[in-house]
C-alpha cells in the first residue's frame, strides 16, 4: 500500500477546520475489516485518531478530529480537524496498514490574519519641527509573528529607531506594538505595515502630522 | 507462534553497562514495532523505550534517557537495549515487547512479551 | 504524563466469581486502554486491546468496556487459572502508563 499527502504545508485560519489529505489505492475486494488507519502527531508520536477493528476509535485529541467514513473504502484516510488553535500547528503523521503498510507526514500552518493597525502619537499636541515623537502602531490576534515595515510619506523606508515586541496571548495569537521614534519635519505622513508572512496579508495603519489637527 | 526471548541480563556494579538482547521468531519481525518494559521487583510494569519498524523513530522514558540506546537488526530478528551508567533503581527484569503495527507511539499497543532478563545493579 | 489508578490493589475472591477491576486515567485516553494478565515469574499477556477487543484465545469469560477515563474489566465467572494479577495500559500517547496492579487471590 502507498500513501499518498500533499507535499505542501496545509495553511488553516485559527478557528476554522482543516482538513489533512491522505489517501492510499485500495485493491479490489477490500474491505474496512482489513485496514488500519492511524493519525499521530509526528513528533511526540501522541495518538490523534484511529480506525482498527473495522471501526473508527475516534477522536484522541481533544474531540475535534474526524475521519470521512464514507471515503475510507475508496482510500480516502483525510482527518478533519474542526475549530483550529494556535498548539494544532505541527507534523501529523498518517499511518495505513492493510496487508503491508506506508506511512506519511503532512505539516499543518496555522495562520490568524493581524488587524488594522491602531495609531498613537505622544506627545499628540503642540507638536513642532524638529520635535522628537513617539509613533506607536499596534496591531492585534495575528498569527504567526508579524513582520512590521515603517515608511514615511515618500515611501522611503524608516529602519532606524523602530522598536517592535510582540507578545501572545492565551490562545496564542500575538499582538504586535511597534514604536517609531522620528524628529518631526513641516509635515509628513508615518505609515506602519504589518505582514502576516504566512498569509501574505498586509494591514496599514498611517498618521499625517500636519501641524494642527493631526489626521489618522 | 510469536516468541520473545530476551538475554543478556546479570549482576553489574552502579555506573557500569548490559546488552540486552531479544530474539524474534514467528512472525515477520520488520513488520513491527518493538519496546522494552521493565519490573522492579515486586513492583508494577514501566515503559522504557520502544523503537519503529524501520528505526527511524526511537522514544525513551524520562528516567533512562541519555543512558539506554534502543536498537535493532532485521536481518538478525534481533532487538537490543544498551544500558550504560546504570544505577540500583534500574534493578528490574526487562521484558521485550512487540507492538501490534510497524509504528510506535500512540494506538500502538503491545500485544507479546518475552519472559524477561534480570538486570541487577549492586555494588 | 497521563497517570492510570486501578482499584482495588487486591481482591479475594471464589471460583466461579464475578469480579470486576477499573481502571481511571487522570486525562482521556479514547479508546486506547488495555489489559494486561501477569502471573508470577511469567510474561505480562494481552486479554483486552482498545477497551474492549479480545485478543485472540483469550477466553471470553474477559470483557473490557469503558470510555475517555474509566474504564472495566470483568471477569464474568472466575476459573482457577484466573488467579493473578492484572494490569491496565493506556496506549493513547507515550510514555506509556501502567495501573498499579490488581492482585486476585483465591477466598
Known amino acids: 500500500v502507498e500513501v499518498q499527502v500533499s507535499e505542501d504545508p496545509v495553511v488553516a485560519l485559527v478557528d476554522t477546520d482543516a482538513t489533512l489529505r491522505c489517501s492510499f489505492s485500495p485493491e479490489p475486494g477490500f474491505s474496512l475489516a482489513q485496514l488500519n488507519l492511524i493519525w499521530q502527531l509526528t513528533d511526540t508520536k501522541q495518538l490523534v485518531h484511529s480506525f482498527t477493528e473495522g471501526r473508527d476509535q475516534g477522536s484522541a485529541y481533544s474531540n475535534r478530529t474526524a475521519l470521512f467514513p464514507d471515503l475510507l473504502v475508496q482510500g480516502n484516510a483525510s482527518l478533519r480537524l474542526q475549530r483550529v488553535r494556535v498548539t494544532d500547528e505541527g507534523s501529523y503523521t498518517c499511518f495505513v496498514s492493510i496487508q503491508d503498510f506506508d506511512s506519511a507526514a503532512v505539516s499543518l500552518q496555522v495562520a490568524a490574519p493581524y488587524s488594522k493597525p491602531s495609531m498613537t502619537l505622544e506627545p499628540n499636541k503642540d507638536l513642532r519641527p524638529g520635535n522628537m515623537v513617539t509613533i506607536t502602531c499596534s496591531s492585534y490576534q495575528g498569527y504567526p509573528e508579524a513582520e512590521v515595515f515603517w515608511k514615511d510619506g515618500q515611501g522611503v523606508p524608516l529602519t532606524g529607531n523602530v522598536t517592535t515586541s510582540q507578545m501572545a496571548n492565551e490562545r496564542g495569537l500575538f499582538d504586535v506594538h511597534s514604536v517609531l521614534r522620528v524628529v518631526l519635519g513641516a509635515n509628513g505622513t508615518y505609515s506602519c505595515l504589518v505582514r502576516n508572512p504566512v498569509l501574505q496579508q498586509d494591514a496599514h495603519g498611517s498618521v499625517t502630522i500636519t501641524g494642527q489637527p493631526l489626521t489618522f | 507462534e510469536v516468541q520473545l526471548v530476551e538475554s543478556g541480563g546479570g549482576l553489574v556494579q552502579p555506573g557500569g553497562s548490559l546488552r540486552l538482547s531479544c530474539a524474534a521468531s514467528?512472525?515477520?519481525?520488520?513488520?513491527?514495532?518493538m519496546g522494552w518494559v521493565r519490573q522492579a521487583p515486586g513492583k508494577g510494569l514501566e515503559w522504557v523505550s520502544s523503537?519503529?519498524?524501520?528505526?527511524?523513530?526511537?522514544e525513551y522514558a524520562d528516567s533512562v534517557k541519555g543512558r539506554f540506546t534502543i536498537s535493532r537488526d532485521n536481518s538478525k530478528n534481533t532487538l537490543y537495549l544498551q544500558m550504560n551508567s546504570l544505577r540500583a533503581e534500574d534493578t528490574a527484569v526487562y521484558y521485550c515487547?512487540?507492538?501490534?503495527?510497524?509504528?510506535?507511539?500512540?494506538?500502538?499497543?503491545?500485544?507479546?512479551w518475552g519472559q524477561g532478563t534480570l538486570v541487577t545493579v549492586s555494588s | 504524563d497521563i497517570q492510570m489508578t486501578q482499584s482495588p490493589s487486591s481482591l479475594s475472591a471464589s471460583v466461579g466469581d464475578r469480579v470486576t477491576i477499573t481502571c481511571r486515567a487522570s486525562?482521556?485516553?479514547?479508546?486506547?486502554l488495555a489489559w494486561y494478565q501477569q502471573k508470577p515469574g511469567k510474561a505480562p499477556k494481552l486479554l483486552i486491546y482498545?477497551?474492549?477487543s479480545l485478543q485472540s484465545g483469550v477466553p471470553s469469560r474477559f470483557s473490557g468496556s469503558g470510555s475517555g477515563t474509566d474504564f472495566t474489566l470483568t471477569i464474568s465467572s472466575l476459573q482457577p487459572e484466573d488467579f493473578a494479577t492484572y494490569y491496565c495500559?493506556?496506549?493513547?500517547?507515550?510514555?506509556?502508563?501502567f495501573g498499579q496492579g490488581t492482585k486476585v487471590e483465591i477466598k
Open positions: 486525562q482521556s485516553v479514547s479508546s486506547h
Open positions: 523503537i519503529s519498524w524501520d528505526s527511524s523513530s526511537k
Open positions: 515487547a512487540r507492538a501490534w503495527i510497524a509504528i510506535i507511539g500512540g494506538g500502538a499497543h503491545f500485544d507479546y
Open positions: 514467528g512472525f515477520t519481525f520488520s513488520d513491527y514495532g
Open positions: 482498545l477497551t474492549s
Open positions: 495500559m493506556q496506549s493513547k500517547s507515550l510514555p506509556f502508563t
